[in-house]
Interface confidence: low
């Protein structure tokens, strides 16, 4: 079942999803589909990365942190009610049938005043290539012995300490981790 | 200040193992990928594979998958290497080395700009 | 894997010349090329990164070329304190970094 993750209208909304190239540079597909993950895919893309950078994007969604070292957590900007509901992050790992999916439920709330709309105190530029703030590591770690051999170590939906505190007290923290290799 | 400070030469029997440690300071540890090289005496430079602090992920040199084995603890900012089944080929000076923390689409490979000073393992009966 | 071979082995020099460094790949590893200085008993010094970017703390005499395949190290007036090893090292195939085999840099 999906992890809830909660903002206000007016706010960035913060969708934690993580895996660790097991080297730097050593890049896996992400995409972010609005929905929960497909068969294959994901549905509604609002952001793809490939082996090298990101390169599919659309208005308001961002990587706010080090997607070069396997942090693709989507940050939505100045969310709306109409933000609600189910998203997918699909790491493409090489193979068949060996992408990992998580789907995230955001639940966004009323505001309690309208706000002016604001962005995240690390918002640096206008371009999610160039944005590289760090995040924190998983809690735990599950072994999974029948994967391929191949040059990625970690997978994980993690919620990291936000950058924006306003949000700290809706997110519910995730263990889920998944080692390969 | 950036600093490495790695543990003490050993002397070492062959067959058995040794654990070093390297630990880090001057800078937030989960953030920068560690590496282990070996130099034998008067030659280059091997790497042997590379943790991410961050989760304690690996990547390995296949020739020292089996030989080597990198961990990390994040409480104490300190990565550890564990060689086994030591043989005089394993004689060396090893080295931790901080991988560069540098973003931008034209590059996807790391360098290493802050290393320790090098522990060296001697394997003599 | 990717081969890196230096050239000289040993390069003698008079400190106030200026001398170039060789390091080529057996396969182009476009700009992923980082160049260091190892003296006698120290650890290896981070030069040069990415082929041609500077280093912090490093003398602007230092600077470095070539993208692919072929890389020079370049040395503008060569000071007493630069001599002694020099290692390339590619760091665009994985699982391996490899470095070449060094350059001795001596006074003549």
């Known amino acids: 079942s999906e992890v809830e993750y909660r903002a206000e209208v007016g706010q960035n909304a913060y969708l934690p999803c993580f895996y660790t190239p097991a080297a730097p540079g050593n890049l896996v597909p992400v995409c972010w589909g609005k929905g929960a993950c497909p068969v294959f895919e994901c549905g509604n893309v609002v952001l793809r990365t490939d082996e090298r950078d990101v390169n599919y994007w659309t208005s308001r969604y961002w990587l706010n942190g080090d997607f070069r070292k396997g942090d693709v957590s989507l940050t939505i900007e100045n969310v709306t009610l109409a933000d609600s509901g189910i998203y997918c992050c699909r790491i493409q790992i090489p193979g068949i049938m060996n992408d990992e999916k998580f789907n995230l439920k955001l639940v966004i709330k009323p505001a309690k005043v309208t706000p002016a709309p604001t962005r995240q105190r690390d918002f640096t530029a206008a371009f999610p290539r160039m944005l590289t703030t760090r995040g924190h590591g998983p809690a735990e770690t599950q072994t999974l012995g029948s994967l391929p051999d191949i040059n990625l170590t970690q997978i994980s939906t993690l919620a990291n300490e936000l950058r924006d505190s306003r949000l700290a007290n809706d997110l519910r923290d995730s263990g889920a981790t998944i080692r390969i290799g | 200040e950036v600093q490495l400070q790695q543990s003490g030469p050993v002397l070492v029997k062959p067959g058995t193992s040794v654990k070093m440690s390297c630990k880090a300071s001057?800078?937030?540890?989960?953030?920068?990928?560690l590496n282990w090289v070996k130099q034998s005496h008067g030659k280059s430079l091997e790497w042997i594979g590379v943790?991410?602090?961050?989760?304690?992920?690996?990547t390995y040199n296949p020739k020292f998958k089996g030989k080597a084995t990198l961990t990390v603890d994040k409480s104490s900012s300190t990565a550890y290497m564990e060689l086994n089944s030591l043989t005089s080929e394993d004689s060396a000076v090893y080295y931790c080395?901080?991988?560069?923390?540098?973003?931008?689409?034209?590059?996807?490979?790391?360098?290493?700009?802050?290393w320790g000073q090098g522990t060296s393992v001697t394997v003599s009966s | 894997d990717v081969v890196l071979t230096q050239s000289p082995a040993t390069l003698s020099v008079t400190p106030g010349d200026s001398v170039s460094l060789s390091c080529r790949a057996s396969q182009s590893i476009s700009n992923n090329l980082h160049w260091y200085q190892q003296k006698s008993h120290e650890s290896p010094r981070l030069l040069i990164k990415?082929?041609?970017q500077s280093i912090s703390g490093i003398p602007s005499r230092f600077s470095g070329s070539g993208s692919g395949t072929d890389f020079t190290l370049s040395i503008n007036s060569v000071e007493t304190e630069d001599f002694g090893m020099y290692f390339c090292q590619q760091s665009n195939s994985w699982p391996q970094y490899t470095f070449g085999g060094g350059t001795k840099l001596e006074i003549k």
């Open positions: 080395a901080r991988d560069v923390d540098y973003f931008d689409n034209k590059y996807v490979g790391y360098a290493m700009d802050y």
């Open positions: 990415y082929t041609s």
């Open positions: 943790i991410n602090p961050y989760n304690g992920g690996t």
């Open positions: 001057g800078y937030t540890f989960t953030d920068y990928y």
